[in-house]
C-alpha cells in the first residue's frame, strides 16, 4: 500500500510515493495497450528492432498546483507528463504537433515513467496564517517500455486509490508550520 | 511495501539518554517527513515531533524541547530519536511514523519500549 | 495547546452494529482532524484524514464527518477485526495533539 494519488477539481493528477502517476485522459492513446484483436503477438512494423534504447517517448511538461483536501501550494509545481505512445527515436517530431507522429500498427512500447522526484511544497489554506508542508512525487524523467501479451490494462494504472474530496465545511486555519521552513524556499529544493 | 522497522527495547536509568532507530524501506526517507510518537502504558498518544531528512529541518512539541533530537541518515534511510535527561515518566513505547505531510501519519514503525528505572 | 476530547471512552458493540464515536477540539480546528486505529500490542494505523477522507485501503465502512469543533467516525456495520481502539488527531496546531481514545469491546 502505496501513498495515494490525489486528483482535486480540476483533474490535475497528484501522484504521491510509491505510484505511477497516470498520463491525462487527453494524452491516453487506448491503441497502445494489448487487445484481443492482435492475439496477444506484438504486430510487425516497418521499424521492427530489439533495442529498446532505439526507441524514444514524448515529454510533456505539465504546470500545475499541488492541492491537498482545502489547501493548494503556494507556487505551481512543473512535471513530465509521459505520452502514451514510443517510436524510434529518429522519427519523433521535437514539438507536439509538428512533422508526420509515427504510429505502429498495434502496440508495442509504452511510454512510462521512468525516475521520479520528490519535492517539498508549501500548502496554502484558506484563512490559514501559515502554509502547511507536503511532498509529492514528481515524473522527472520517461522511458519506453516493451509490452508482452502478460501486460494488460490494469498493469500501467495508478496503485492508489482515488481520495474522496474532503467534506465540505469551515476552512482549515493551519498553524502547524516550522519558523525554519517558513524562511526557506522549499520549492526548489530538489 | 512501506516499511518501518524499529531497534529494540531499551532499559535506561534516570538522567540517562536513550536513541531510538527506525530504519525505512519502500521509499526514500529523504522523500518523507518523520514523526515520532510516544505512548505511556495503558495511556494515549502524545506527538513528540517531526524532521524532514532532506533538509534537516525539525520541529518538536514544547514540551520536549531542549531533550529531543531527530536525525536521519539518508544514505542508509534510517530515523533517529535521542531523548536525554530521562525521568521514569518517559518510560513509554515511542513509534516512529512517516508520511507525505507534517500533519498525519501515514505509516508506523512496529514501536520500540523505553523503560526508565532506577 | 488543543485538548481533544472523545467520547465515549469505551462501549460494547456486536458484529453488524453501526457505531459511532465523536472527537471534540477545544478550538476551532476546521477539518484538520485523522482518524487511526489502534490494536493491542500493535501500532496505530491511520483510517480517515482531513476529517472525511478515507485512507487507501480502509474499508468503506469507515466513515469520518464533522468540521470545526466536532467530528465524528461512524463504522456502518461491525466487524470481528474492527474491535480496537480509536484516536482522534488534530493538524491544524503544533503541538498535534490526540484524543484520549475510545475503546470498542465485543458485547
Known amino acids: 500500500q502505496g501513498w495515494q494519488a490525489f486528483k482535486n477539481d480540476a483533474t490535475e493528477i497528484i501522484p504521491e510515493l510509491g505510484e505511477y502517476p497516470e498520463p491525462p485522459p487527453e494524452l491516453e492513446n487506448n491503441k497502445t495497450m494489448n487487445r484481443a484483436e492482435n492475439g496477444g503477438r506484438p504486430p510487425h512494423h516497418p521499424f521492427e528492432t530489439k533495442d529498446v534504447s532505439e526507441y524514444s517517448c514524448r515529454e510533456l511538461h505539465f504546470t500545475r498546483y499541488v492541492t491537498d483536501g482545502p489547501c493548494r501550494s503556494a507556487k505551481p509545481v512543473t512535471e513530465l507528463v509521459c505520452s502514451g505512445q514510443c517510436g524510434p527515436a529518429r522519427l519523433l517530431p521535437n514539438a507536439i504537433g509538428r512533422g508526420k507522429w509515427w504510429r505502429p500498427s498495434g502496440p508495442d512500447f509504452r511510454c512510462i515513467p521512468d525516475r521520479y522526484r520528490a519535492q517539498r511544497v508549501q500548502l496554502l489554506c484558506p484563512g490559514g496564517e501559515a502554509p502547511r508542508a507536503r511532498k509529492v512525487r514528481l515524473v522527472a524523467s520517461c522511458k519506453c517500455k516493451r509490452l508482452t501479451r502478460f501486460h494488460n490494462q490494469s498493469e500501467l494504472k495508478d496503485f492508489g486509490t482515488e481520495a474522496a474530496r474532503p467534506q465540505k465545511g469551515r476552512k482549515p486555519r493551519p498553524r502547524a508550520r516550522s519558523a525554519k521552513a517558513n524562511q526557506a524556499e522549499l520549492e526548489n529544493a530538489y | 511495501q512501506v516499511q518501518l522497522v524499529q531497534s529494540g527495547a531499551e532499559v535506561k536509568k534516570p538522567g540517562a539518554s536513550v536513541k531510538v532507530s527506525c530504519k525505512v524501506s519502500?521509499?526514500?526517507?529523504?522523500?518523507?517527513?518523520q514523526h515520532w510518537v510516544r505512548q505511556a502504558p495503558g495511556k494515549g498518544l502524545e506527538w513528540m515531533g517531526w524532521s524532514d531528512p532532506e533538509i534537516g529541518d525539525t520541529e518538536y512539541a514544547s514540551k520536549f524541547q531542549g531533550r529531543v533530537t531527530m536525525t536521519e541518515d539518508t544514505s542508509t534511510d534510517t530515523a533517529y530519536m535521542e531523548l536525554s535527561s530521562l525521568r521514569s515518566e518517559d518510560t513509554a513505547v515511542y513509534y516512529c511514523a512517516t508520511g507525505d505531510t507534517t500533519y498525519k501519519f501515514d505509516f508506523w514503525g512496529q514501536g520500540t519500549t523505553v523503560t526508565v528505572s532506577s | 495547546d488543543i485538548q481533544m476530547t472523545q467520547s465515549p471512552s469505551s462501549l460494547s458493540a456486536s458484529v453488524g452494529d453501526r457505531v459511532t464515536i465523536t472527537c471534540r477540539a477545544s478550538?476551532?480546528?476546521?477539518?484538520?482532524l485523522a482518524w487511526y486505529q489502534q490494536k493491542p500490542g500493535k501500532a496505530p494505523k491511520l483510517l480517515i484524514y482531513w476529517a472525511s477522507t478515507l485512507w487507501s485501503g480502509v474499508p468503506s465502512r469507515f466513515s469520518g464527518s464533522g468540521s470545526g469543533t466536532d467530528f465524528t467516525l461512524t463504522i456502518s456495520s461491525l466487524q470481528p477485526e474492527d474491535f480496537a481502539t480509536y484516536y482522534c488527531q488534530q493538524g491544524d496546531t503544533l503541538p498535534y495533539t490526540f484524543g484520549g481514545g475510545t475503546k470498542v469491546e465485543i458485547k
Open positions: 478550538q476551532d480546528i476546521s477539518t484538520a
Open positions: 519502500g521509499f526514500p526517507i529523504k522523500d518523507t517527513f
